[in-house]
């Protein structure tokens, strides 16, 4: 049976614009099966740290060790892959840091950097000084292992010089890399000595070798690409949001709900209301009113703005998010003060998430 009674019809618009809600691109940690993985929670001044995996509380067990700001996973398995978060609870607020773990056969060191320079790598030589190919910028080649989330763009670079100017070709897993070997092909920017693959997919995983050669010699360098696959998960809401707020009668207030969901999320802002002087229906369930929801006619659904508030607007506001996998919700309280009282930071009321699930 439903856990609440809706006060009014809240039929949703038939279509929602496709949006990808993501708090940030989480850092990716990659481990091979059987290895141990240690991650430090990158939050400052953490009095108490709690951990979650795919939005579910993570506690210590025979393979998971939680010591202070460190999470250790012993003997990692593919099932340990997912979206992790550590939340630092402080006296007045809390903060959450997200990261992804991918347990795969390929070890790698994170995302590639952007090619902001490049032209300077194309070195011209005095025509008399014949020279075999050589690397001109080994710093840009140090990171051999690249773990990239699916759908991202990858760039491998082999800045080189030589006289005559060397040519560059690319191999994948030791064989000639042809355009037809991947959907959408790839780009080679000879000026920048780079190979670019857009919207990488799992089949792009492998070893990529640049071969730079002229008539005086040949050099090569190999990169390893791992495409980190996402795992579908229920929506995850940033801890501490929406935050409690207070304002005077006639003031304006804003609640913010930060959502992490790869799958299309549907966001609703819900408030407990009264009907005929009662907060509960005949079935004993609370009356709830949907104030705003994501859809074609709705602007930024992650924000609920209330203008010219009255005392009747005081109460609990719930941010409820759903995707095709599951739901999550958190709530905050609005305190409306009489006009003569200036609003202060809420301390007395602490929002405990009103999980309907």
């Amino acid at each position: 049976r439903p856990s609440f009674s809706l006060v009014e019809d809240t039929t949703l618009e038939p279509e929602e614009p496709p949006t990808k809600y993501q708090i940030s691109q989480p850092e990716v940690y990659v481990a091979a099966p059987g290895e141990s993985l240690e991650v430090r929670c990158l939050l400052k001044d953490a009095a108490v740290i709690s951990w979650t995996k795919d939005g579910v509380h993570l506690g210590p067990n025979n393979r998971t060790v939680l010591i202070g700001e460190y999470l250790q996973i012993k003997g990692a398995t593919p099932r340990d892959s997912g979206l992790y978060a550590c939340t630092a609870s402080r006296t007045v607020d809390s903060e959450t840091w997200y990261f992804m773990v991918n347990v795969t056969d390929a070890i790698s060191s994170g995302d590639d950097e952007d090619d902001t320079d490049g032209a300077e790598d194309f070195v011209s030589e005095n025509s008399n000084n014949k020279r075999a190919p050589y690397w001109t910028n080994t710093e840009k080649m140090e990171k051999r292992l690249h773990a990239v989330p699916a759908a991202n763009t990858v760039k491998f670079r082999c800045p080189a010089g030589g006289n005559p100017m060397p040519t560059m070709r690319w191999l994948k897993n030791g064989k000639e890399f042809k355009q037809e070997h991947r959907i959408g092909g790839y780009k080679v920017r000879n000026q920048h000595w780079s190979l670019i693959m857009e919207s990488v997919v799992p089949s792009d995983k492998g070893n990529y070798t640049c071969v730079v050669e002229n008539e005086y010699g040949s050099i090569n360098h190999t990169y390893h690409l791992d495409v980190v696959e996402r795992s579908p998960h229920r929506p995850i809401l940033q801890a501490g949001l929406p935050a409690n707020a207070s304002t005077v009668v006639g003031g304006d207030v804003e609640f913010v709900c930060k959502v992490y969901s790869d799958a299309q999320p549907h966001i609703q802002w819900i408030k407990h209301v009264e009907k005929n002087g009662s907060k509960y229906g005949p079935d004993g369930l609370p009356y709830l009113k949907v104030l705003k929801h994501s859809g074609i006619n709705s602007s930024n659904a992650e924000v609920l703005a209330l203008f010219n508030v009255t005392e009747a607007d005081a109460g609990e506001y719930i941010c409820k998010v759903s995707n095709y996998i599951g739901q999550a919700n958190q709530s905050a309280w609005l305190t409306v003060l009489p006009k003569q009282q200036a609003p202060g930071r809420e301390k007395e009321i602490t929002a405990s998430p009103d999980y309907l699930e």
């Epitope: 856990s3 038939p14 996402r230 579908p232 759903s322 995707n323 739901q327």
Partner: antibody, heavy 112, light 106 residues
Framework: QVQLVQSGAEVKKPGSSVKVSCKAS????????MHWVRQAPGQGLEWMGA????????DYSQKFQGRVTITADESTSTAYMELSSLRSEDTAVYYC?????WGQGTLVTVSS | EIVLTQSPATLSLSPGERATLSCRAS?????MYWYQQKPGQAPRPWIY???NRATGIPARFSGSGSGTDYTLTISSLEPEDFAVYYC?????????FGQGTKLEIK
């Protein structure tokens, strides 16, 4: 491991109702939507609706609104799909699905 | 509602060949999902979030695309790959499927 076990085949008369059950095990039943999808003989797949057992939220395809009722019993980890005012074109295999796992399907035949 | 159109309806190829299945949406979706179905069996989730293989799906399968155009590619067909493949969108209710592409042995 995750399992979704559906009730057996049904033969129904036009105008009547059918209620198909789907018993879940191997995961937290209340934390995931249970979807219902049907497939007429030799045809494609059609999403009908879903329920979130944790709070009994439902989401229906407009095509079936008013004729389909999806419910869930958390105590037995079972979801139900009831389709009323049956007609011959409702003859199909009905599947329950937790996004990454599907039941084996229940054949409902509507015939006079 | 978002209409998904799969092409071709039937694809006749031999083992070892490359297969390219297309799915076009009537309006933009953020991700595409693919299922494989064999006769007498329930559909099996195959690719999720456009390009991620479901557990146990071989690396010869890859998904790509964005907006309204999506593709499922099988780099080198194995005998067990011959089946019907459906695309699906989870972007807006009703969550529609394509009509399916039947991949058959030539």
């Amino acid at each position: 491991q995750v399992q979704l076990v559906q009730s057996g085949a049904e033969v129904k008369k036009p105008g009547s109702s059918v209620k198909v059950s789907c018993k879940a095990s191997g995961y937290t039943f209340s934390s995931y939507w249970m979807h219902w999808v049907r497939q007429a003989p030799g045809q494609g797949l059609e999403w009908m609706g879903a329920i979130y057992p944790g709070n009994s939220d439902t989401d229906y395809s407009q095509k079936f609104q008013g004729r389909v009722t999806i419910t869930a019993d958390e105590s037995t980890s079972t979801a139900y799909m009831e389709l009323s005012s049956l007609r011959s074109e409702d003859t199909a295999v009905y599947y329950c699905s937790k996004f990454d796992y599907w039941g084996q399907g229940t054949l409902v035949t509507v015939s006079s | 509602e978002i209409v998904l159109t799969q092409s071709p309806a039937t694809l006749s190829l031999s083992p070892g060949e490359r297969a390219t299945l297309s799915c076009r949406a009537s309006s933009s979706v953020n991700y595409m999902y693919w299922y494989q179905q064999k006769p007498g069996q329930a559909p099996r989730p195959w690719i999720y979030l456009t390009s991620n293989r479901a557990t146990g799906i071989p690396a010869r399968f890859s998904g790509s695309g964005s907006g309204t155009d999506y593709t499922l590619t099988i780099s080198s067909l194995e005998p067990e790959d011959f089946a019907v493949y459906y695309c699906q969108q989870w972007s807006s209710n009703p969550y529609t499927f394509g009509q399916g592409t039947k991949l058959e042995i030539k």
